[in-house]
Amino acid sequence: QSSERRVVAHMPGDIIIGALFSVHHQPTVDKVHERKCGAVREQYGIQRVEAMLHTLERINSDPTLLPNITLGCEIRDSCWHSAVALEQSIEFIRDSLISSEEEEGLVRCVDGSSSSFRSKKPIVGVIGPGSSSVAIQVQNLLQLFNIPQIAYSATSMDLSDKTLFKYFMRVVPSDAQQARAMVDIVKRYNWTYVSAVHTEGNYGESGMEAFKDMSAKEGICIAHSYKIYSNAGEQSFDKLLKKLTSHLPKARVVACFCEGMTVRGLLMAMRRLGLAGEFLLLGSDGWADRYDVTDGYQREAVGGITIKLQSPDVKWFDDYYLKLRPETNHRNPWFQEFWQHRFQCRLEGFPQENSKYNKTCDSSLTLKTHHVQDSKMGFVINAIYSMAYGLHNMQMSLCPGYAGLCDAMKPIDGRKLLESLMKTNFTGVSGDMILFDENGDSPGRYEIMNFKEMGKDYFDYINVGSWDNGELKMDDDEVWSKKSNIIRSVCSEPCEKGQIKVIRKGEVSCCWTCTPCKENEYVFDEYTCKACQLGSWPTDDLTGCDLIPVQYLRWGDPEPDYKDDDDK
């Protein structure tokens, strides 16, 4: 698809905002070199495209926000892949590098003559992309051109570093916070020995690094740590699963700082290898409460505890989205492809290269069927509003008393826009305050979800707790029907009274064998026996020594009973 023309969604406006959404899945391993993307995505793709288009309509019809200025957009497909996203970001920048002296819309030729070719309006900022690894690559390019970037789900801690990523902001918190939340859950259930898996790439790597650092400080041991790409083949996932079983039955909990598709790969491998129910997966927000992760593999996912960024459904988006139809929705260039994929049917008159669907789409089809709103919809919308409010504040300060774009905003200076964005605060789509700290990050509030079997062959995510500003609240009775059901994930059981822990050479501190102290020794600390001094003996509880009372013989006492060696 590298040679293939990439599709773009346009919406005209006075100011153009760029957006990168994963309209398609990332290329499979064998297609990476061609940059040939996978199947079309609904939640992470089409819904986000429609959210952008409709949110801009709402902003444009709001008389109090950017009056007399129309916001437009150019939406491109990142395919959740760095190479594709970079290629698309270059397209954002190409044709729109207009010097301040240049007359907008006119391009000068090398010989000095003018051309009637209308250049594209410059992109003033970019919304997205979703993946941290991809966002980092895109930021590396955008910051060269002073183009602010607002992410809605890229949560890697690395992106907080403003010396490296100056033009990057996000309406979501850094992963340091959810790593803390995951450690707090592990601590709550006394899991001291866990396996760890992360998605290769920045999100998984930095998140798992934070999880491991925090775990070590809390005395939690990692049995082994593994990494895998989301698009790795079946064999790779199977091998990883087999490696995880080698730590059973001790490490039953697997902490997964993973993208959703990595979790799905693990679930599929569990099915293939017959390992359903052997592990409890503790997943990061890449999994959250996504059905596209668990669909068809619910039995394998049961019991999973996941972290989800707090973001209630946006009702007005559903009101808009569920009315969309392929015959009338022409501004979203991916919509017809999506419709066919969603309903596994063929649209009349739609050019289908391989006509993979035999039946024709029925006119009664509706998106209401099995509709699930993208769990990060609120963040996508908040990111778009952040850009709008940033531009609004910039217009107010640069064009006082002027409605519309004044000369001071032509062209828009990315440095000034960034300054304005960093100071932005407004009430978000769910009623919460949206603001940015000095690193361009937003505060962290998470929901704790549990994937449960609710009835025969009916599975769902239920909210079992929250993590807000360092405080974990969990409904333990909802997660475990009774205390005895709490999964154990420990390497060694506590030692009995009068025993000490002996840690085997090369083992982690959570794995020990219990050894009793000698007859004249007491337990000095959990790793050491100490001999009582002459004339003293260990106490009954073996925590110290008592002096042996000296008994003096008096005249008239019976003779002490003793046996000579000669007595047989």
């Epitope: 064999q235 199977d238 091998k239 087999k242 079983t245 080698s246 059973l248 039955p249 039953r252 099915r271 293939r272 290898l273 017959g274 390992l275 129910g277 052997e278």
Partner: antibody, heavy 116, light 110 residues
Framework: QSLEESGGRLVTPGGTLTLTCTVS????????MSWVRQAPGKGLEWIGI?????NTWYANWVKGRFTISKTSTTVDLKMTSPTTEDTATYFC?????????????WGQGTLVTVSS | AFHMTQTPASMEVAVGGTVTMKCQAS??????LNWYQQKPGQPPKLLIY???KLASGVPSRFKGSGSGTEFTLTISGVECADAATYYC????????????FGGGTEVVVK
């Protein structure tokens, strides 16, 4: 460490029979256990496995005719409605791991004869 | 469904000779392939695990190799005590399995 199967006998078709594998020196909460059978003059045929967690898996041909369960010192194989085809020596074997890998310890086997 | 195929079903070898038998998995099983030796009236005994690792107490004349779907057991310097039936077993998956064991290869020592 040892395994000993018991309960093998002559049984009529359609009845039920439970074979027991008694373990000694093995922590069944740490190891998976398999049942394997061998008809006279034939090869080894895997019946199923009970993981350390208590989860069970069976060969496709079992189709509910066998059930594996365990206590802290025994692993049982319950046979329902046996046919003459089920005549075999039944072995229990310890897996090297908590799930499924290789069978490193075997019992001597117990003979089940199904005949009317 | 998962199944294992062993070849040949039977073979003859002279004392001191070398014998090679094959085992094929219907799907890739990485190196999760084990070999057992069984003598009449006895339970099977583990020889080789994870394709090439020798079980404790097993002489070094037994050698396992292979990965994926093709595996081989080689016995060099065959002794009379090696007369037995040899079975391969996949240790990869318990899901959708017909039999984890191959059909066996009988080795007759002359």
């Amino acid at each position: 460490q040892s395994l000993e199967e018991s309960g093998g006998r002559l049984v009529t078709p359609g009845g039920t029979l439970t074979l027991t594998c008694t373990v000694s020196g093995i922590d069944l909460s740490s190891y998976a256990m398999s049942w394997v059978r061998q008809a006279p003059g034939k090869g080894l045929e895997w019946i199923g496995i009970i993981y350390a967690s208590g989860n069970t898996w069976y060969a496709n041909w079992v189709k509910g005719r066998f059930t594996i369960s365990k206590t802290s010192t025994t692993v049982d194989l319950k046979m329902t409605s046996p046919t003459t085809e089920d005549t075999a020596t039944y072995f229990c074997a310890r897996d090297s791991s908590a799930t499924f890998n290789y069978l490193d310890l075997w019992g001597q086997g117990t003979l089940v004869t199904v005949s009317s | 469904a998962f199944h294992m195929t062993q070849t040949p079903a039977s073979m003859e070898v002279a004392v001191g000779g070398t014998v090679t038998m094959k085992c094929q998995a219907s799907e890739s099983i990485d190196t999760y392939l084990n070999w057992y030796q069984q003598k009449p009236g006895q339970p099977p005994k583990l020889l080789i695990y994870q394709a090439s690792k020798l079980a404790s107490g097993v002489p070094s004349r037994f050698k396992g190799s292979g990965s994926g779907t093709e595996f081989t057991l080689t016995i060099s310097g065959v002794e009379c005590a090696d007369a037995a039936t040899y079975y391969c077993q996949q240790g990869w998956s318990t899901n959708d399995v017909d039999n984890v064991f191959g059909g066996g290869t009988e080795v007759v020592v002359k």
